[in-house]
């Protein structure tokens, strides 16, 4: 499109230059050319001459009509055929856009990643609008009644420095575009309840040479949070089924978790944590791959029914991955295995 054009006349759009997708649209062209009584007025859309639904209203004005216009963007211009002129003469041009009013933002979530210094809020925007849509995030203190507002496109990071007057807030998101406005539901936020511990990392793994070999996985986090609840999930790279082991962790030292695994197999491990009793999980850590050593004696191994030595383990569950061919794109498919945890974070992609 063209932002500024010297018009020798006017072009206007009904119902307007931005309209709801699927509406009927009329575009008018009115010439004000000197020394020209146009034989014809022509319309072009994105540089292509239009042939149909054009009406000459009078000597200076013509209209083109579109039934159910559904292109998100188009550049329209019109020209005149002046007697004695070899080329058509430009009259005017306009950018037009069609789209939808915004949906009400849904699934509003706010978290504070430990050490980040920010509260990060995300939401689902709903169906595409095709036009410029902005989101206004309202953050209102429940203690001082003071309200702050932040403009965003898809998420917002709010410095915790600007949230020092209070611990309890009401957060909601307003979606705004040329065709409408919608508000999300309000979210009650207590800053102490939304902290996600600093990232957990699996640093190494080793398999012992015992009669019954065991694999020890070492993992750590720089979190300062004292009570942390973690899950480690693991599976062979050829398998679709994850096993999940739960731990109460204390990161003042490196965590060691023991597993009795299938010998001579390649395993993928991942860990994630949350502050004990809170709802927000870390994303799963990067996949850590470990090869177990070859077995000496024959035995049928079933990792999920083996005895676990680690005293803090609580339960082991099974979850199926989407594809056995793509270990980097594994997903938790079921939230039912987590007793008492909300579904938040259970659909976190890896990789």
């Amino acid at each position: 499109g063209i932002t500024s054009i010297n018009c020798s006349g006017d072009m206007w759009v009904e119902p307007g230059e931005i309209f709801q997708m699927g509406m009927n649209v009329s575009i008018y062209c009115q010439e004000a050319l000197k020394h020209c009584r146009p034989r014809n007025l022509y319309f072009y859309k994105n540089g292509f001459k239009e042939e149909f639904d054009i009406t000459r209203i009078n000597r200076t004005t013509a209209r083109i009509w579109y039934k159910g216009f559904s292109e998100p963007h188009a550049y329209m211009h019109c020209t005149a055929e002046c007697p004695g002129h070899f080329q058509e003469t430009l009259i005017c041009g306009k950018d037009i856009s069609s789209g939808h009013p915004p949906d009400a933002p849904s699934n509003l979530t706010c978290v504070i990643y430990e050490y980040s210094g920010n509260m990060t809020c995300t939401w689902n925007t709903g169906k595409p609008t095709y036009i410029d849509t902005k989101y206004i995030v309202h953050v209102k203190s429940l203690e001082t009644e003071e309200e702050q507002q932040y403009l965003a496109s898809s998420y917002v990071k709010i410095s915790t420095d600007s949230l020092q007057g209070s611990r309890k807030y009401l957060v909601w998101v307003q979606a705004v575009n040329s065709l409408g406005m919608e508000n999300s539901q309000q979210l009650h936020v207590h800053l102490d309840d939304i902290v996600i511990p600093s990232a957990s990392i699996i640093s190494r793994a080793e398999t012992t040479n015992d009669t019954v070999p065991k694999t020890i996985v070492y993992w750590k986090s720089k979190t300062m949070i004292e009570k942390v609840f973690c899950e480690m999930r693991y599976k062979t790279t050829t398998n679709q089924t994850w096993s999940v082991k739960e731990f109460d962790a204390n990161f003042t030292y490196v965590q060691q978790s023991e597993f009795y695994l299938e010998p001579d197999s390649k395993y993928v491990f991942q860990v994630r944590c949350q502050e004990t009793g809170k709802r927000n999980w870390q994303p799963w850590s990067s996949p850590f791959v470990h090869q177990t050593s070859q077995e000496t004696g024959k035995r049928n191994w079933q990792p999920w029914s083996s005895p676990f030595v680690h005293q803090t383990s609580q339960t082991v569950s099974q979850v199926t991955a989407k594809s056995s061919h793509e270990p980097q794109k594994m997903e938790m498919l079921s939230a039912t295995i987590f007793r008492g945890h909300p579904a938040s974070g259970n659909h976190q992609d890896i990789g």
Partner: nanobody
Framework: QVQLQESGGGLVQPGGSLRLSCAAS????????MRWVRQAPGKGLEWVSG???????IYADSVKGRFTISKDNAKNTLYLQLNSLKTEDTAMYYC??????????GSQGTQVTVSS
């Protein structure tokens, strides 16, 4: 209490420019989102533009590409730069707290008249 005082309006020819100011006091300006609204003769209030505390901006379609909103936290002042003015921009301009909305809190406003 919150006080807002607009200035900078005047009479200008079509295609001309103006810079409106809004001096703010009585609240923490640097943490506040602000907006401009206007009221043309015989018409209702119309939201024009908004800015948040970090400088992110939003504009009404009718002024996009011609008007620029900004704020100077050191001076507790909100600005609206009006370029390529049209006769339909003639209105009383008001500033208010908050990014978006077609209301204002009773400040006296500043008159912009675009006429040849």
């Amino acid at each position: 209490q919150v006080q807002l005082q607009e200035s900078g309006g005047g009479l200008v020819q079509p295609g001309g420019s103006l810079r409106l100011s809004c001096a703010a006091s009585g609240f923490t300006f640097r943490l506040s989102a602000m907006r401009w609204v206007r009221q043309a003769p015989g018409k209702g209030l119309e939201w024009v533009s908004g800015i948040d505390s970090r400088g992110s901006t939003i504009y009404a379609d009718s002024v996009k590409g011609r008007f620029t909103i900004s704020k100077d936290n050191a001076k507790n002042t909100l600005y609206l730069q009006l370029n390529s003015l049209k006769t339909e921009d003639t209105a009383m301009y008001y500033c208010a707290q908050g990014v978006y909305g077609d209301t204002y809190s009773g400040s006296q406003g500043t008159q912009v008249t675009v006429s040849s």
